[in-house]
């Protein structure tokens, strides 16, 4: 004969455990029902009566099967630099993520504690590694034959245009200026993903290094996550 199905509350077998979605109540010394997500234990079980569950109040939640006496409070409203990607319901906490152009500088268990504006690379430097949800932009000096004349969190170093006759040689922060009205613009290898076509390096220019107060680039690409920074567009 099949074993009889036990209904909660029941005493477990010696050395046995309670079933899924049940818990062992130390006071009653019985296996009792857990409450489903969105509810909490209003009255704990006894030897003769099972757990009494009740719905979570507004702005509180439980995400798992539980026997907590009170639901958890939802996190505070998202700050101005964040967007709410998951609303507070009886079954889930509010989740705030950083708005576009920002990244999470200080994280918490769920969502982000503090967002920071993506830093920009200044002229003479291009984006080496784009910003992500959790890391800042990394900049790199434009190599000889390339330039960036913008302050941007997205622009990479672009090759100088090739001139038939150079009027002004390009440098790290400025494109070459041609005397000819139609400079050559050929696609750089592997650059098809870029929004605008870029030429191969110019052999006619002698680029000067980008102006930088930093004597080296040891701060540029640290091992591990890039050093981020905080900022908020101002008042």
């Amino acid at each position: 004969l099949p074993a009889q199905v036990a209904f909660t509350p029941y005493a477990p077998e010696p050395g046995g455990t309670c079933r899924l979605r049940e818990y062992y109540d130390q006071t009653a010394q019985m296996c009792c029902s857990k409450c489903p997500p969105g509810q909490h234990a209003k009255v704990f079980c006894t030897k003769t009566s099972d757990t009494v569950c009740d719905s979570c109040e507004d702005s509180t939640y439980t995400q798992l099967w539980n026997w907590v006496p009170e639901c958890l409070s939802c996190g505070s409203r998202c700050s101005s630099d964040q967007v709410e990607t998951q609303a507070c319901t009886r079954e889930q906490n509010r989740i705030c993520t950083c708005r576009p152009g920002w990244y999470c500088a200080l994280s918490k268990q769920e969502g982000c504690r503090l967002c920071a504006q993506l830093r920009k690379c200044r002229p003479g430097f291009g984006v080496a590694r784009p910003g992500t949800e959790t890391s800042d932009v990394v900049c790199k000096p434009c190599a000889p034959g390339t330039f960036s004349n913008t302050t941007s969190s997205t622009d990479i170093c672009r090759p100088h245009q090739i001139c038939h006759v150079v009027a002004i040689p390009g440098n790290a922060s400025m494109d070459a200026v041609c005397t000819s009205t139609s400079p050559t613009r050929s696609m750089a290898p592997g650059a098809v993903h870029l929004p605008q076509p870029v030429s191969t390096r110019s052999q006619h220019t002698q680029p000067t290094p980008a102006p930088s107060t930093a004597p080296g680039t040891s701060f540029l690409l640290p091992v591990g996550p890039s050093p981020p920074a905080e900022g908020s567009t101002g008042d």
Epitope: L106, R122, F219, L220, P227, A229, E230, G231, T233
Partner: antibody, heavy 121, light 110 residues
Framework: QSVEESGGRLVTPGTPLTLTCTVS????????MGWVRQAPGKGLEYIGF??????TYYANWAKGRFTISKTSSTTVDLKMTSLTTEDTATYFC?????????????????WGQGTLVTVSS | DIVMTQTASPVSAAVGGTVTIKCQAT??????LAWYQQKPGQPPKLLIY???TLESGVPSRFSGSGSGTEFTLTISGVQCDDAATYYC????????????FGGGTEVVVK
Amino acid sequence: QSVEESGGRLVTPGTPLTLTCTVSGIDLSSYTMGWVRQAPGKGLEYIGFISSSGHTYYANWAKGRFTISKTSSTTVDLKMTSLTTEDTATYFCARDGGYGGYDYTGIFNLWGQGTLVTVSS
Amino acid sequence: DIVMTQTASPVSAAVGGTVTIKCQATESISSWLAWYQQKPGQPPKLLIYGASTLESGVPSRFSGSGSGTEFTLTISGVQCDDAATYYCQQGYIYTNVDNTFGGGTEVVVK
């Protein structure tokens, strides 16, 4: 390249005051400029800065009461309102080093000599 | 809020000796840390940025180390001219902070 602060003087509590930072040999469209203060015998206290692209950043305590703005190609102002005796300090203007090719790093490598603001009744 | 805490003042050193100043951040700041030297009546002078990169023109007896939350400034072969107050500064967060600087550590050279 140099940085010089001006406008510091003795004022009574509640009086607004504007300090000016004048730069020489520095392109304000390429560099971020910040303000730091130091009360007599105390440590350095970050106020905020204005990036080369014009964004402003402030310490919590400075928000709403202090305003940083570029007023010309060579000057950056620090406007202060509702001054109290606690604001008595030497105010320094400094240039951000732009390390790692960044627009701003909050790390300052060229400082002015400072201008003294005394708030007293 | 990230708070920077430095070694208590004063720190004494003999000429030719070694001085170590510690700086602790309440949150990880990666390598976004700078060290400054300030003498009375003068503005601060940047010594080290990126936790360990020596600013141009700064003597090599100054060195910095650390990452995350623990940082150290070391002065090897201390000279009389090194008597000053030293400040650490985090460059990780600029808003939602009360101060980016540590409280300062005075170095006295005997």
